[in-house]
């Protein structure tokens, strides 16, 4: 059962499994729904005690009933992880607290303008948990504007006390804030040296990837296949880090692989959610339950309903047992990962699916797979939508994306002579224009948000952002698509499609069906080439073939360049101008999302 | 086929930092099988390794010209380059770039396979 | 940092010859090893790969073998074009090292 509320002056009794420090009660239970055993907790307030020592503290809690008894108690607050919830959870915390000090290792120290200069600093440290900022108003002048960026092994405080004049908050790492850079590459029969900061068992090097991601101290990884000779560190995940941030050295060794932590481009790739499955394969731990199932899919919908299940190994039947069915091993471990993983045992393991709602929803698999397009099918881009205007009459105005729950990107060239949001209605989830009729349910928008400075499409800033009335339910016809990570600055994209409802020829009328069509990109050197009377700044991305062919076109605009990049699609481009329509040499361009980030983040979450 | 191109001033002042570009035509320098490496040789001497680069920006450098190296990549343009800092007679060398294969497919394939045709760079004032 | 030897330092051999070059390196290597020709005024070029992988197109008289710290290049049958001089290198640490290098001359 899901239970988001807080219970004041209430402390949850034993099951304790950790305490940390945390600044809030909010934090301390997302604190919990990170921790692979925590169900309960409960926070110490300031009031909660006369020791100082033991204020701020977050008593991380398990109970094989999933509750606890509940005591009375002044300045305490209890509360339930989000495990048991089905909603999306983030680890981004923005809040700053005043006269709050974090304490952790300060391993860096500058001046800084402001606390969100100084949170800045921390995001863009690939060491940075958290920091402390003293403010113009504090008592010691030579610590003055001072920006302490503090580490600690958990990520959390070891301690934090009240202090005057001073701001402390988290990196924002976990919000794809970090300008720091991505390396997504799997780098094969390497091993990297460096200093081991834990290890655990993994099936393979991704979800290795992702354990050291998520893992505060982890920067990278040397993770030992199944095929390593020494038979005791067979599927051995390495959890690393240095002090530069990088492995010092690379050692080659056959059947090891290495890898980065992906904290800094958390947001467009899964991180938490490890949904592959594992033949013959035994994952060991603790077990929870035996249940008879049939298949190994059941066993893993089984784990994921059973809150306390990490993950599981499924027997399957012998040809004429158990009408089919085969036992289901629920475990779990301390860490989340298996204790041990045998191979060659005929079982097929695998992970809970809990987790996935931790990781952003644009990043959930899609089903696998404009002029000179073809019709898309249904469900084939989920986050492209039709936006309608209702004056004079209701007609198709222009595409656009769902990035939010609450929130569209399209193209403000699209709002020209639109004097009221009240006009506009956002339908999501369709496939055909012709499903649009008088009772068809739509979004009302709230609120126009176009860039400031925007003129007109050919000369940039041809952004804006519709914010909707009521919220989005993901569903697998709509949902979100990730935005360009700011660490992926070097990546070529080479599997970009755009699409929408506009004109498959220059003069002619909306399609019915939502048209898609490949597209190469242009290099922004060879754009500007084919268009000498426009100024292609950094801004704008270009895409098309030489010999034309396939564009977007009118009633395109405001519609996805959508880009795949390790299996997850990217908001590349927003459809903004071009000369005709797939006009030999006369590529599209878009708007290049990529430069805009900041500026959409403002936006969505001020 | 895959080709490179060292560029850049062949003469340097003592103290100045050497530049130099090598272009790569022919294939993409955006692979994950691939560091981009660059060697030197002084004059009548053995081939000295100074770093490599792969396409995301991890680099790796000889620890004895560590404090003065610098090796980035620019996917756009598919070109890496080489910075040398406060140069002296010693650096007088033929600057090679390369191709340096790091398992391409799973197959173990490794070693330089593709090299420029080399650099010479003077250190003079 | 890994260092590698080579020797002879030269050899002198006539067409036809058998020659063999050897490359001991100061610490197990594996097969991490590769073996490059250079010829004056030219970039090098490579042989051998993963200590006895035969890079293609080059002459199957090339061939490798060792592994861990001793290494061995062979030439079957020398060629007119073969006369160069040939250097080992090992991969499989970073700093990257050459060996001195063998300089294979007309007898």
């Known amino acids: 059962e899901c239970v988001t509320r807080l219970f004041k002056d209430i402390h949850f009794e034993g099951g304790d499994i950790a305490t940390v420090f945390t600044p809030s009660a909010k934090h301390c239970q997302v604190v919990c729904t990170h921790h692979p055993r925590c169900l309960l907790f409960t926070f110490t307030g300031e009031s909660a005690s006369e020791d100082p020592t033991q204020w701020f503290t977050c008593v991380l809690k398990d109970s094989v009933t999933e509750t606890l008894p509940r005591v009375n108690r002044t300045g305490a607050i209890s509360g339930y992880s989000f495990k048991q919830c089905s909603h999306q959870i983030s680890a981004c915390n923005k809040d700053i607290y005043v006269d709050l000090n974090m304490k952790g290792i300060n391993y860096n120290s500058s001046l800084a303008e402001s606390a969100q200069e100084c949170q800045e600093r921390c995001t863009d440290d690939v060491h940075c948990h958290f920091f402390t900022y003293a403010t113009r108003q504090f008592p010691s002048l030579e610590h003055r504007n001072i920006c302490l960026l503090k580490h600690t092994q958990t990520g959390t405080p070891t301690g934090i006390m009240k202090l005057d004049k001073v701001v402390t908050g988290f990196s924002l790492k976990s919000c794809a804030l970090s300008n720091l850079a991505c390396i997504r590459d799997v780098f094969p029969n390497t091993a990297f040296a460096d200093s081991n900061i834990d290890s655990v068992m993994a099936p393979d090097a991704f979800v290795c990837r992702r354990i050291c991601t998520h893992h505060p101290g982890c920067l990278f990884f040397t993770f030992f296949s199944q095929e390593w000779p020494k038979e005791s560190q067979r599927n051995l995940c390495l959890l690393k880090t240095s002090e530069s941030g990088l492995p010092s050295t690379r050692i080659k060794k056959s059947k090891a692989l290495s890898g980065f932590s992906l904290q800094s481009c958390r947001h467009s790739i899964p991180v938490f959610c490890h949904s592959s499955f594992y033949h013959d394969t035994d994952f060991l731990g603790e077990e929870l339950d035996i249940v008879a199932v049939k298949g190994h899919e059941a066993c893993q919908k089984l784990c994921t309903n059973a809150v306390r299940c990490q993950f599981f190994t499924y027997a399957p039947a012998q040809a004429s047992c158990n009408e089919g069915k085969g036992k289901c091993y629920l475990k779990l471990s301390s860490n989340g990962s298996p204790t041990k993983i045998l191979r060659g045992t005929g079982g097929i393991s695998g992970y809970t699916l809990r987790l996935c709602k931790m990781d952003n929803e644009c990043t959930t698999k899609i089903k696998p797979r404009i002029v000179g397009g073809t019709a898309s099918v249904r469900g084939e881009w989920p986050w492209q939508v039709t936006l309608h205007t209702t004056s004079p009459t209701q007609r198709h105005l222009c595409g656009g994306s769902i990035i939010g729950n609450q929130w569209i990107l399209t193209a403000a060239h699209c709002f020209y002579g639109v004097e009221s949001p009240k006009i506009l209605r956002v339908y999501i989830g369709i496939l055909n224009q012709s499903e649009i009729k008088e009772d068809t349910s739509f979004f009302g928008v709230q609120e126009i948000i176009i860039h400031d400075q925007y003129k007109m499409a050919e000369s940039g800033y041809d952004i804006a952002l519709l914010k909707l009335e009521t919220t989005v339910n993901y569903t697998d016809s709509q949902r979100p698509i990730c935005l360009p990570s700011k660490g992926d600055r070097n990546v070529i994209y080479t599997d970009c499609w755009v699409t929408g409802w506009g004109y498959r020829k220059l003069r002619d009328k909306i399609q019915n069906t939502l048209q898609k069509a490949k597209i190469p990109l242009v290099t922004n050197d060879e754009c500007q080439k084919r268009y000498r009377g426009h100024k292609i700044t950094h801004k704008m991305i270009c895409a098309g073939y030489r010999e034309g062919g396939k564009d977007a076109c009118k009633g395109d605009s405001g519609g996805p360049l959508s880009c795949k990049h390790n299996e997850v699609w990217h908001l590349v481009g927003i459809t903004s101008w071009g000369e005709g329509c797939a006009q030999r040499e006369r590529p599209g361009v878009y708007t290049n999302v990529l430069e805009y980030v900041d500026w959409i983040l403002e936006k969505t979450q001020a | 086929q895959v080709q490179l191109q060292e560029s850049g001033p062949g003469l340097v002042k003592p103290s100045q930092t050497l530049s130099l570009t090598c272009t790569v035509s022919?294939?993409?320098?955006?692979?994950?099988?691939?560091?981009w490496s660059w060697i030197r040789q002084h004059p009548g001497k053995g081939l000295e390794w100074i770093g490599s680069i792969h396409y995301s920006g991890l680099t790796y450098y000889n620890p004895s010209l560590k404090s003065r190296v610098t090796i980035s990549v620019d996917t756009s343009k598919n070109q890496f380059s080489l910075k040398l800092s406060s140069v002296t007679a010693a650096d007088t060398a033929v600057y090679y770039c390369?191709?340096?294969?790091?398992?391409?497919?799973?197959?173990?394939?490794?070693?330089?396979?593709?090299w420029g045709q080399g650099t010479t760079v003077t250190v003079s004032s | 940092d890994i260092q590698m030897t080579q020797s002879p330092s030269s050899v002198s051999a006539s067409v036809g010859d058998r020659v063999t070059i050897t490359c001991r390196a100061s610490?197990?290597?594996?097969?991490?090893l590769a073996w490059y020709q250079q010829k004056p005024g030219k970039a090098p070029k490579l042989l051998i790969y993963?200590?006895?992988s035969l890079q293609s197109g080059v002459p199957s008289r090339f061939s490798g073998s060792g592994s861990g710290t001793d290494f061995t290049l062979t030439i079957s049958s020398l060629q007119p074009e073969d006369f160069a001089t040939y250097y080992c290198?090992?991969?499989?640490?970073?700093?990257?090292?050459f060996g001195g290098g063998t300089k294979v001359e007309i007898k």
């Open positions: 022919g294939g993409s320098i955006y692979s994950g099988a691939y560091y």
């Open positions: 610490q197990g290597i594996d097969s991490w």
């Open positions: 290198q090992q991969y499989h640490i970073v700093p990257i090292t």
């Open positions: 390369a191709r340096d294969v790091d398992d391409s497919s799973g197959d173990e394939h490794y070693g330089m396979d593709v």
């Open positions: 993963a200590a006895s």
